[in-house]
Amino acid sequence: VTCDDYYYGFGCNKFCRPRDDFFGHYACDQNGNKTCMEGWMGPECNRAICRQGCSPKHGSCKLPGDCRCQYGWQGLYCD
């Protein structure tokens, strides 16, 4: 059985389209499961992995490896 584009698995009922945009940064494995690109995490791979040591409470990042501080906090790790 050959599945349609972006469909995987037994019965071709698993859908996965690789994407690299605001809504996700991932490839699809042979079973149609998302595999996040380096630097991204979460079920949709749309959450950037911040700089190692970045304060989870006072820092955040839009892009991997970044660490943006909340107002009132500073430093490399916003701590």
Epitope: C16, D21, F23, G42, E44, R47, C50
Partner: antibody, heavy 119, light 107 residues
Framework: QVQLVQSGAELKKPGSSVKVSCKAS????????MHWVRQAPGQGLEWMGA????????AYNQKFKGRVTLTADKSTSTAYMELSSLRSEDTAVYYC????????????WGQGTLVTVSS | DIQMTQSPSSLSASVGDRVTITCRAS??????LAWYQQKPGKAPKLLIY???TLADAVPSRFSGSGSGTDYTLTISSLQPEDFATYYC?????????FGGGTKLEIK
């Protein structure tokens, strides 16, 4: 279970701004972007934009660029949509909505917030 | 931006009828299409995603088909609770636009 609870109805003057809130529960807030969709009375649905609460990244419908601002507060799992320079055509029900799992589109919706713009 | 053209805009039918609503995208959306049902005063409810997959707890009388730019929602045997407005929506690339809607009324 996933729940999205929005703030109450608003009556606004033309030229002013409105800020609608959407409190999320039942899932990890930072795992999914929050989208905003509006519906004018008797009209269809219009996607306004989305925010990734984890890092604050945003995507906007160009139609609203410059007038709409999406923000999120991770500490309270609340997303906000602020629309400025209001005009009568902005009278609509505003919905926050979230994708489901495994690439669903909008599986979860808030109850909607009616914003009326009138002088 | 990809535009979605939905037809018909309104439709009268009877309980038990088979009904088809179509949606055409201005570009290839690769099955990234959803169908919603909306009743007055309520938020839309997801029926079908990825063109043909039924959302949770949606009755099997609803089905979706299509590929490329042309997609169809079919209700095999209308029930009284199916009279509502139906919207298609693509989610291939931002902005994620909706069709204009199809109001399904009782004949």
């Amino acid at each position: 279970q996933v729940q999205l609870v929005q703030s109450g109805a608003e009556l606004k003057k033309p030229g002013s701004s409105v800020k609608v809130s959407c409190k999320a529960s039942g899932y990890t807030f930072t795992d999914y972007e929050m989208h905003w969709v509006r519906q004018a009375p008797g009209q269809g649905l219009e996607w306004m934009g989305a925010i990734q609460p984890g890092g604050g990244g945003t995507a906007y419908n160009q139609k609203f660029k410059g007038r709409v601002t999406l923000t999120a507060d991770k500490s309270t799992s609340t997303a906000y949509m602020e629309l400025s320079s209001l005009r009568s055509e902005d009278t609509a029900v505003y919905y926050c909505t979230r994708r489901g799992y495994d690439d669903y589109p909008f599986a979860y919706w808030g109850q909607g917030t009616l914003v009326t713009v009138s002088s | 931006d990809i535009q979605m053209t939905q037809s018909p805009s309104s439709l009268s039918a009877s309980v038990g009828d088979r009904v088809t609503i179509t949606c055409r995208a201005s570009g290839n959306i690769h099955n990234y299409l959803a169908w919603y049902q909306q009743k007055p005063g309520k938020a839309p409810k997801l029926l079908i995603y990825n063109a043909k997959t039924l959302a949770d707890a949606v009755p099997s009388r609803f089905s979706g088909s299509g590929s490329g730019t042309d997609y169809t929602l079919t209700i095999s045997s209308l029930q009284p609770e199916d009279f509502a407005t139906y919207y298609c929506q693509h989610f291939w690339s931002a902005p994620w636009t909706f069709g204009g809607g199809t109001k399904l009324e009782i004949k």
